[in-house]
Amino acid sequence: GQFRVIGPGHPIRALVGDEAELPCRISPGKNATGMEVGWYRSPFSRVVHLYRNGKDQDAEQAPEYRGRTELLKESIGEGKVALRIQNVRFSDEGGYTCFFRDHSYQEEAAVELKVEDPFYWINPG
């Protein structure tokens, strides 16, 4: 059956050095355990995280994300996931695409990550 992929609808904000969670879900909600779920970034569709055949496909991940990402799958049975990025960097800022693929049917959604420093409202010294 067909479905839509829905992102958060607003930019996700994170502080540099902290964690970011980018949520993504399918509608109507259904079990996505057997689906391929992934995140990539332009340009060149760099793989941020890929989940296939019930496993994270670490070997396909872009080197700048290696060891820093986790697919949160607690609600994958309802078609809801989130990508956690640890040790967020300024270079992580920008557009991400999440996708769900069920056999030959694939849909995707855009998610924006905004990375900030924690010092906007503080005076040094």
């Epitope: 540099v16 050095g17 040790n87 300024f90 270079s91 905004k114 420093d117």
Partner: antibody, heavy 119, light 106 residues
Framework: EVQLVESGGGLVQPGGSLRLSCAAS????????VNWVRQTPGKGPEWVGF??????????EYAASVKGRFTISRDDSKNSLYLQMSGLKTEDTAVYYC??????????WGPGVLVTVSS | ELVMTQSPATLSLSPKETATLSCRAS??????LAWYQQKPGQAPRLLIY???TRATGIPARFSGSGYGTDFTLTISSLEPEDFAVYYC????????FGQGTKLEIK
């Protein structure tokens, strides 16, 4: 290859002014925060200030010891960072480093440039 | 101001030994802690950020641990090129460095 190179150092009298430059190459300069840090011989480095990337407004923040005397600016079209120093004191004598920040820590350092404040 | 205190000031070891460097923050910096290596006449080089994550190109013999106020840099099986000054730095509340630990050949 990511590279930062400082220039403009030298000898200046107390109360005088000096402008340091930092030329960046090998990365998209406008995407990153850039810091100035200084170090005197035998001591740990001291943070001077940083300037935010374009996405976060390009505004600068300063250490209390230099606030009101030093100004950091950037020209993304020239891949360049600047440190305008005025009202210089003898205690400002140090090697000054330009540093790229991606992780929040100080990821890539230039080789440094010496500033000597003396009469 | 957040103060970073490193110990010992000097550490004398032989190649192939293990070095353990300590850094203490005057208040919690969570995991916003970095380690740098500096050799004479050179700029510092980032080794570890986020208390335990190795920077790009840093050998596996360098490892960092700790959280909050107490942190450790461990260098296993010392190589001749590892003898240098090491600084810790917090980036939780602006930026402050420790005074450094000099790792010298015994």
């Amino acid at each position: 290859e990511v590279q930062l190179v400082e220039s403009g150092g030298g000898l200046v009298q107390p109360g005088g002014s000096l402008r340091l430059s930092c030329a960046a190459s090998g990365f998209t300069f406008s995407d990153y925060y850039v810091n100035w840090v200084r170090q005197t011989p035998g001591k740990g480095p001291e943070w001077v200030g940083f300037i935010r990337n374009k996405a976060n407004g390009g505004t600068a923040e300063y250490a209390a010891s230099v606030k009101g005397r030093f100004t950091i600016s950037r020209d993304d079209s020239k891949n360049s960072l600047y440190l305008q120093m005025s009202g210089l004191k003898t205690e400002d004598t140090a090697v000054y480093y330009c540093i790229l920040s991606d992780t929040g820590a100080f990821d890539v350092w230039g080789p440094g440039v010496l500033v000597t404040v003396s009469s | 101001e957040l103060v970073m205190t490193q110990s010992p000031a000097t550490l004398s070891l032989s190649p192939k030994e293990t070095a353990t460097l300590s850094c203490r923050a005057s208040q919690s910096v969570r995991s916003y802690l970095a380690w740098y290596q500096q050799k004479p006449g050179q700029a510092p080089r980032l080794l570890i950020y986020g208390a335990s994550t190795r920077a790009t190109g840093i050998p596996a013999r360098f490892s960092g641990s700790g959280y909050g106020t107490d942190f450790t840099l461990t260098i296993s099986s010392l190589e001749p090129e590892d003898f240098a000054v090491y600084y810790c730095q917090q980036y939780s509340s602006w930026y402050t460095f420790g005074q450094g630990t000099k790792l010298e050949i015994k």
